[in-house]
Each structure stands twice: as C-alpha cells, then as structure tokens.
Interface confidence: low
C-alpha cells in the first residue's frame, strides 16, 4: 500500500485513479470501514466519519479518473489506512500526520536551550534532521535539543521528519535574542566624543527591559555602574547615570550611549547587559574603549594609549615625510629630543591603522 | 496588575531587631529596583532605602546606614528589609514601592506595614 | 544629602481654587523631581515625573514645573478629592530625599 506523510495543521490529498477516464461511482473509507465521501448520482456525499466536515473532493477531476480525497486542517489522530473504492477496486492509502512544535516560546535568549518535539501516530518510528539557518544539523527521535543557542541559529529551521522512505518537511522560524555583535572596541584620541551603538539581532513588536552598563576602567580598582535605564516599547528611559563621565542615552532603539569625551580614566571594558521582561536570563554585549594621547613636555615626545589593546597592535610615532620612526608592542612609545613638524601617533594592527593621533613639534631656538 | 504586600510588622522593644518582607507580584520582580519608604505616625515621608534589581547596589538614607540592610530573593519575588539595632524614631508605617517603568517616580506601592519600637 | 524644602506646609482652599505649592532643592537636581499625593491611611501617589511630567492616569489639571533648585506643583482648579498631603521627592542622588510635605485642607 502506498504511505504518505502529513503534517498538522495542513492539507493533504490522497488520490485515488480509476483505469477509465469518466465519471464514476467512488468511495473513501477509513480502516474501519466507516464511509467518509463519495460520489452519489452528480453529488459528493458524506458519511458518519469524524473526518466529515474537513473532507472535500476535487470535482472538477472526476470526469478525469481522478477521487482524489483532500483532508484540511490534518490532525495526528487522522492517521490511519484511508481505501478508496472504484471499479471493484479497492486502492489502501496509509496516512502518517507528524507534527513539530518548539517546546518553549520560539523567541529564545543567546545561550538557552531549544527544545523541539515531534507528535507522532503510534505505531511509527519516525526519525529527525533539523537544520539551522548557519547550516548546523542536528539528529534525533521524538525529540530534538539544541543545548545552546548562538545568534547565528536566528532564522529558519528546516526539519524534515522520515518514515518508510517517505519525508514530509516542517519549518520553524526561532529568534535569539542577541545583540548583533558580542564584543566590540571604539578607538578614540583623548578628547574626542564617543559613540557606543549596541544593536540589536531581532526585532519584537513590544520590547521592554531594563539594563545597565557596567564598566571597569583600566585605572580604577573596581568596576562601576555607568548607567542604568529602562526600555519600554522600544522607548528608553535612563534611571541612573553615573556624574562622572556624564553619559547621554538615546531615546530610541538601538541602544546609543554618548561619552562627552574620551579621557584615559575612562578607557577599560563595559558590559551592556540587558533583561527583558518576561525573559529570564539577559542579553550581553561587551564594549572597549582605548584612549590614545600624544604629547610633548620639554624634550619628550610621547604617545600613550589606555584601553584593552592585544599585545600584538603596535604603536608608532612617526615624522610626517620623513623616515624617522620609533614602534613598540607596548602602550607607550616617545621619541627624546623630537625633530620640528608634524608627528604621528599611530596604533595599528598588522599594518591597519585602528587610531591616529598628529602633534606638531615647534623648533626649540 | 502589579501588587506589593508588605509583612514583618509589629511591637518590638528598642534595640532589637525585626526583619520585614515585600512579596511582589503582577510584574517580572528581577527587572526592577525596590524601594522602601517610611512614614511616621502624623509625620511626613521618609525614604529608606533602595536595592537594584539584581541586589548588586544599595543605598541607604543616613538615619538608617549602619542599621538597616536591605535585601531580595528573586527566586521569591521578595524584598527584605532587616532592622537592627532599633530606636524609637524608627516608629512608622513602612511601604515598599517601586519604580514605573517609564520615568523614576515611584509609581507602584504597598499597602505598608506598622513598626512600633517602644518598651 | 540634599535637603528638600517644601513650602508652604499646610494651606487652606476651596473648591475651584488654583492651587501653589513649591519645592526647594539644597543643591541642582536639574529635573530630577517627583511630586506625591497621599491621602489618610494609604499610600502616595505619583502625579508628575521629572518635574513636569504628568504620570499615566493622573488628572490634567495637575501640572508641575521647575528645573535646578525651584520647583512648582500646581492644582488648576481643587476638587473635594484633592483635599490629601502634597510630597515633593528628588530622585537625582542617592539618598533620595522627601520634601516635608504640604496639607491641602478645605477652608
């Protein structure tokens, strides 16, 4: 007998062909031999069956040889085997509907766990591949977990669910709710105002919070509360801000903060945490900020930088036209007795220049 | 609809101690800074106390510091508010409030629990 | 601690009157203020936020303004429910602070 697979919620059409192209009597049945529809005279009639109301036939394609029965709105109880009788024929269908739904709410935190779970006829021995929208595949029975999920796993999985040869294919739409990036570094020469952007990787109708922006800065013994504030509706509403740096928050998604300038107290890490409502757990991102001064006092000429920078970015100063050049993998470089013009400062990364700063030297008379 | 219940309340003798408790209902209690607020008897508002939503800051107004210590369990939705060392001008009708979730005010209040510290 | 000085502390009105009550903060709070209703044997109430912001619910004809030290909290027109107490609270630094409060009685 020939098998089809189901899913819940769909439409499935078990067809049905008789030898001669016309218009005849026919008859469906379930494995009980309770009539669900068939042809009387002209008119498609229907039996006692629970199927009754969401059984329907094509009759535009009687005249062709085609009974096919179509079943809305597939429940997994309508799994059975469906005969279709025609010219003393009887023709055995096996109807197999599976259904896969996530065990949680579908809006999932970065590092929760995913649970799907297929529904199943008795009797079948279905088996599941998942795949998600980075290309990861995942294997498993009746149920399938993903113990931790990471931004890239946004998006749609395709699970496609086997059972005697035959597949039948469910997408699941997750969202992980994440910040786009998880660490991001700002550059800035002292003095200069500061941008921090946290987007984020989702969107939600309704987004509310609250967070708070940590920061320990390279100099201070311990890290401190920056800000703090709360989302509603996508709207932002500062609660606290720190007096010293005085940072201003945009009112809109994405999160925006402001640091008025960048001095070398502030350079060091952040982290933006945020805790949305009915979500347990919350949402990270870390940011850096390196600082970098350059300046001249009697007969030195130095450039330093504050901030989390990796032991391999270098730091330069160098005579604007001229060879003259002093680099060191270290946070400070100087140069004594400057030649007059036009300095740099550069901190680079492998030859990509990350921060700049020019000081002009005066000749000393 | 959000709800704050205070408990813990009653006649305690100077220089004892008494714990209260805030339950908190109707809104997700690890989201929000709780405050406690008092008022003695015909006298005006006095703010005590307020621990961030994660328990990682404290503040305290002076009259209470070295005294007081506030508290939650998340896990219970409850706040605490720990009183040592008690004096009779701690007398008063102690409300837990908490913030709104647009602005600063405290728009959220118990119904407030009576502290009488008398011999 | 700041100290909020609020004044004057009880004031007499009738019904239809437009009513005055001022705040002074001992140091800037730029906007940071709240303004409180409480009536007998309940809890206050939240009528403005950050000064001049009318919290969701609350009658429009309460009104408040003032930024840095001087703020002003401001019955239109009284009505038989606004007979309660009046509470300014400073909400820029910890320890918040309490006005001494304000008793709106009916003359």
């Known amino acids: 007998k020939k098998v089809v697979l189901g899913k819940k919620g769909d439409t499935v059409e078990l067809t049905c062909n008789a030898s001669q192209k016309k218009n005849t009597q026919f008859h469906w049945k379930n494995s009980n031999q309770i009539k669900i529809l068939g042809i009387q005279g002209l008119f498609l009639t229907k039996g006692p069956s629970k199927l009754s109301d969401r059984a329907d036939s094509r009759k535009s394609l009687w005249d062709q040889g085609c009974f096919s029965m179509i079943i809305k709105n597939l429940k997994i109880e309508d799994s059975d085997t469906y005969i279709c009788e025609v010219e003393n024929k009887k023709e055995e269908v096996e109807l197999l509907v599976f259904g896969l739904t996530a065990n949680s709410d579908t809006h999932l935190l970065e590092g929760q766990s995913l649970t799907l779970t297929l529904e199943s006829p008795p009797g079948s021995s279905p088996s599941v591949k998942c795949r998600s929208p980075g290309g990861k595949n995942i294997q498993g029975g009746r149920t399938i977990s993903v113990p931790q999920l990471e931004r890239q796993d946004s998006g749609t999985w395709t699970c496609t669910v086997s059972q005697d040869q035959k597949t039948v294919e469910f997408k699941i739409d997750i969202v992980v709710l994440a910040f786009q990036k998880a660490s991001s570094t700002v550059y800035k020469k002292e003095g200069e105002q500061v941008e921090f952007s946290f987007p984020l990787a989702f969107t939600l109708e309704k987004l509310t919070g609250s967070g708070e922006l940590w920061w320990q800065a390279e100099r201070a013994s311990s890290s401190k509360s920056w800000i703090t504030f709360d989302l509603k509706n996508k709207e932002v509403s500062v609660k606290r801000v720190t007096q010293d740096p005085k940072l201003q928050m945009g009112k809109k998604l994405p999160l925006h903060l402001t640091l008025p300038q960048a001095l070398p107290q502030y350079a060091g890490s952040g982290n933006l945490t945020l805790a949305l409502e009915a979500k347990t757990g919350k949402l990270h991102q870390e940011v850096n900020l390196v600082v970098m001064r350059a300046t001249q006092f009697q007969e030195n000429l130095t450039c330093e930088v504050w901030g989390p920078t990796s032991p391999k970015l270098t730091l330069s100063l160098k005579l604007e036209n001229k060879g003259a050049t002093v680099s060191k993998q270290a946070k400070a470089v100087w140069v004594l007795n400057p030649e007059a013009g036009m300095w740099q400062c550069l901190l680079s990364d492998s030859g990509q220049v990350l921060l700049e700063s020019n000081i002009k030297v005066v000749p000393t008379w | 609809q959000v709800q704050l219940v205070e408990s813990g309340g009653g006649v305690v003798q100077p220089g004892r101690s008494l714990r209260l408790s805030c339950t908190a209902s109707?809104?997700?209690?690890?989201?929000?800074?709780i405050h406690w607020v008092r008022q003695a008897p015909g006298k005006g508002l006095e703010w005590v106390t307020i621990?961030?939503?994660?328990?990682?800051?404290?503040y305290y107004a002076d009259s209470v510091k070295g005294r007081f210590a506030i508290s939650r369990d998340n896990s219970k939705n409850t706040l605490y508010l720990q009183m040592n060392s008690l004096r009779a001008e701690d007398t008063a009708v102690y409300y837990c409030?908490?913030?709104?979730?647009?602005?600063?005010?405290?728009?959220?209040w118990g119904q407030g629990t009576l502290v009488t510290v008398s011999s | 601690a700041i100290q909020m000085t609020q004044s004057p502390s009880s004031l007499s009105a009738s019904v239809g009157d437009r009513v005055t009550i001022t705040c002074r903060a001992s140091?800037?709070?730029?906007?940071?203020l709240g303004w409180y209703q409480q009536k007998p044997g309940k809890a206050p109430n939240l009528l403005i936020y950050?000064?001049?912001n009318l919290q969701s619910g609350v009658p429009s004809r309460f009104s408040g303004s003032g930024s840095g030290t001087d703020f002003t909290l401001t019955i239109s027109s009284l009505q038989p429910e606004d007979f309660a107490t009046y509470y300014c609270?400073?909400?820029?630094?910890?320890?918040?602070?309490f006005g001494q409060g304000t008793k709106v009685e009916i003359k």
């Open positions: 609270l400073q909400d820029s630094n910890y320890p918040r602070t």
């Open positions: 109707g809104f997700n209690f690890i989201n929000y800074g």
């Open positions: 409030a908490r913030e709104d979730d647009w602005n600063d005010g405290l728009a959220y």
């Open positions: 621990i961030w939503y994660d328990g990682s800051k404290k």
């Open positions: 950050a000064a001049s």
């Open positions: 140091q800037d709070i730029r906007n940071d």
